[in-house]
């Protein structure tokens, strides 16, 4: 048994039919000796006597809010919340595996720039009563410090018969240094509650793995005199890393009929600007990536070529 | 050329072959995303490797105040992956593929590092730790893990060579 | 809907034996504490014995040595076995049992029977 936080505590049980359990110890948070008795919930019905209470912790049911009163005065709470571990694995009840980039990704994490600031977030068909909290750190053993927010629903959506819902929590490196070569990965620990249980899901990065930088902006066109070709110009995007002579962007800019099926003309580049070869009903479209560091594509920014 | 007594190297070369070195280690392992080398344990046979840190003043300001220390941090860390690229744990079992990029990633880091440290001029460099795996599995970890390793440290050296190309150059 | 039947409550002799059952039924989730409880004509209400969910037994004064508290959590059952039944014992006998239901799946309630009554003459 540990403490989450004042007068919650993780009971972690082995999950298995017939399993003994855990034999927990609450103390009531009083220097009273006598006449104390202690109830759960919402029940008035008392448990025991005694400045302690010791309970065979085997399942939910034996999870909840410990009291302990003294004439009809609470004293202190208890609330015991379950850790299952079966065969040997923690349960993933509460969030959904995203599946991506690779199985068992229950956080995805992204950054815009180099700043040290990252969005994290995670998918659950649960709706009520639920809580997240999101600590964070640079390395384990000698941690440094990373600030997290609060965590907050972010986005709902219907899949199917079932709701999904995403919540997000955006962090802040405390004492980020942008132009370093990181050498210890960011973690990333989530505490999730469902009514009784609880789970913890971590994630670990760094942070030039997840960076997404934003679409361009100001994609423009202009068209090139007695030519089907045509400019695009665009700038980087306001949330890319500063200055852009030392963060730098490479392009990909595509050439897309209205059909999908059409074929997409696309060219790479390091300037800001491109001229191509504008097609009836075509749009153009213009994604960035790190220069020097294959981290993700951003979306495109399109304009029709009309 | 960078020079011990503090003279400036040509920014343009060292960014364009920074540059090809960024290309050519993203090719001689470019599913790094699908792999989280960090969970494969062994930690210790890649956290000896020189990384470009905070205080070695490879930032704009940095560069901008004495780009020496930067030039020098870079230069120790491209004769480290030299040494590593030519050792046992590439040249030995499971052999590379006959058109790996790893020989021109070889050659290209000497190129980089003669560029910034002509012949007779002596900067100190790191000690390279004796890894040498037994089996060809491990060699084959090691090397991405070293590859993983690389990207990050020529992605930093690239940022540093287009930056004082743009706006350090003669 | 929960429910809490009482059963058993019958006019005995002095010295006698009687046992008490009770059975929740309904939408339950789980089963805390299940306590029988009396009251006699005039009086208040008074706890005899509670089992907790693990099953360990409570008396009151009155009801230790003679009683004993015993409860099947598979079939969501609590008994009352009355031995040595004394004039006194006379009164209405109430099962109480704290209960969380799908409304209320992490909070125990408590619930009540309505009664059997328990004559002893002398």
């Known amino acids: 048994i540990w403490e989450l936080k004042k007068d919650v505590y993780v009971v972690e049980l082995d999950w298995y039919p017939d399993a003994p359990g855990e034999m927990v110890v609450l103390t009531c948070d009083t220097p009273e000796e006598d006449g104390i008795t202690w109830t759960l919930d919402q029940s008035s019905e008392v448990l025991g006597s005694g400045k302690t209470l010791t309970i065979q912790v085997k399942e939910f049911g034996d999870a909840g809010q410990y009291t302990c009163h003294k004439g009809g005065e609470v004293l202190s709470h208890s609330l015991l919340l379950l850790h299952k571990k079966e065969d040997g694995i923690w349960s993933t009840d509460i969030l959904k595996d995203q599946k991506e980039p690779k199985n068992k990704t229950f956080l995805r994490c992204e950054a815009k720039n180099y700043s040290g600031r990252f969005t994290c977030w995670w998918l659950t068909t649960i709706s009520t009563d639920l809580t997240f909290s999101v600590k964070s750190s640079r390395g384990s053993s000698d941690p440094q410090g990373v600030t997290c927010g609060a965590a907050t629903l972010s986005a709902e959506r219907v899949r199917g018969d079932n709701k999904e819902y995403e919540y997000s929590v955006e962090c802040q490196e405390d004492s980020a240094c942008p132009a370093a070569e990181e050498s210890l990965p960011i973690e990333v620990m989530v505490d999730a509650v469902h009514k009784l249980k609880y789970e913890n899901y971590t994630s670990s990065f760094f942070i030039r793995d997840i960076i997404k930088p934003d679409p361009p902006k100001n994609l423009q066109l202009k068209p090139l005199k007695n030519s089907r070709q045509v400019e695009v110009s665009w700038e980087y995007p306001d949330t890319w890393s500063t200055p852009h002579s030392y963060f730098s962007l490479t392009f990909c800019v595509q050439v897309q009929g209205k059909s999908k099926r059409e074929k997409k003309d696309r060219v790479f580049t390091d300037k800001t600007s491109a001229t191509v070869i504008c097609r009836k009903n075509a749009s153009i479209s213009v994604r960035a990536q790190d220069r020097y560091y294959s981290s993700s594509w951003s979306e495109w920014a399109s304009v029709p070529c009309s | 050329r960078a020079v011990p007594g503090g003279s400036s190297p040509a920014w343009t070369q060292c960014q364009q072959l920074s540059q090809k070195l960024c290309t050519l280690a993203w090719s001689a392992h470019p599913l790094v995303g699908h792999m989280d080398l960090r969970e494969e344990g062994d930690e210790e046979t890649t956290n000896d490797v020189p990384h470009i840190q905070c205080g070695d003043g490879c930032d704009p300001q940095g560069l901008r105040d004495n780009s020496q220390f930067c030039l020098q941090r870079i230069h120790q860390g491209l004769i480290f992956y030299e040494k590593l690229l030519g050792s046992d744990i590439f040249t030995g079992e499971p052999s590379l593929l006959p058109d790996s990029p790893v020989g021109q990633l070889h050659a290209s880091l000497l190129g980089l590092s003669q560029l910034l440290q002509p012949e007779g001029h002596h900067w100190e460099t790191q000690q390279i730790p004796s890894l040498s795996p037994s089996q060809p599995w491990q060699r084959l970890l090691l090397r991405f893990k070293i590859l993983r390793s690389l990207q990050a440290f020529v992605a930093v050296a690239a940022r540093v060579f287009a930056h004082g190309a743009a706006t350090l150059s003669p | 809907e929960v429910q809490l039947v009482e059963s058993g409550g019958e006019l005995v002799q002095a010295g006698g034996s009687l046992r008490l059952s009770c059975a929740a039924s309904?939408?339950?989730?789980?089963?805390?504490?299940m306590a029988w409880y009396r009251q006699a004509p005039g009086k208040q209400r008074e706890r005899v014995a509670t089992i907790t969910r693990g099953g360990t037994p409570d008396y009151a004064d009155s009801a230790k040595d003679r009683f004993t508290i015993s409860r099947d959590n598979a079939k969501n059952t609590v008994s009352l076995q009355m031995n040595n039944l004394k004039p006194e014992d006379t009164a209405v006998y109430y099962c109480?049992?704290?209960?969380?239901?799908?409304?209320?799946?992490?909070?125990?309630?408590?619930?009540w029977g309505q009664g059997t009554q328990v004559t002893v003459s002398s």
């Open positions: 109480k049992a704290a209960l969380r239901t799908p409304t209320h799946d992490y909070n125990y309630y408590d619930y």
């Open positions: 309904g939408s339950i989730v789980s089963i805390s504490a």
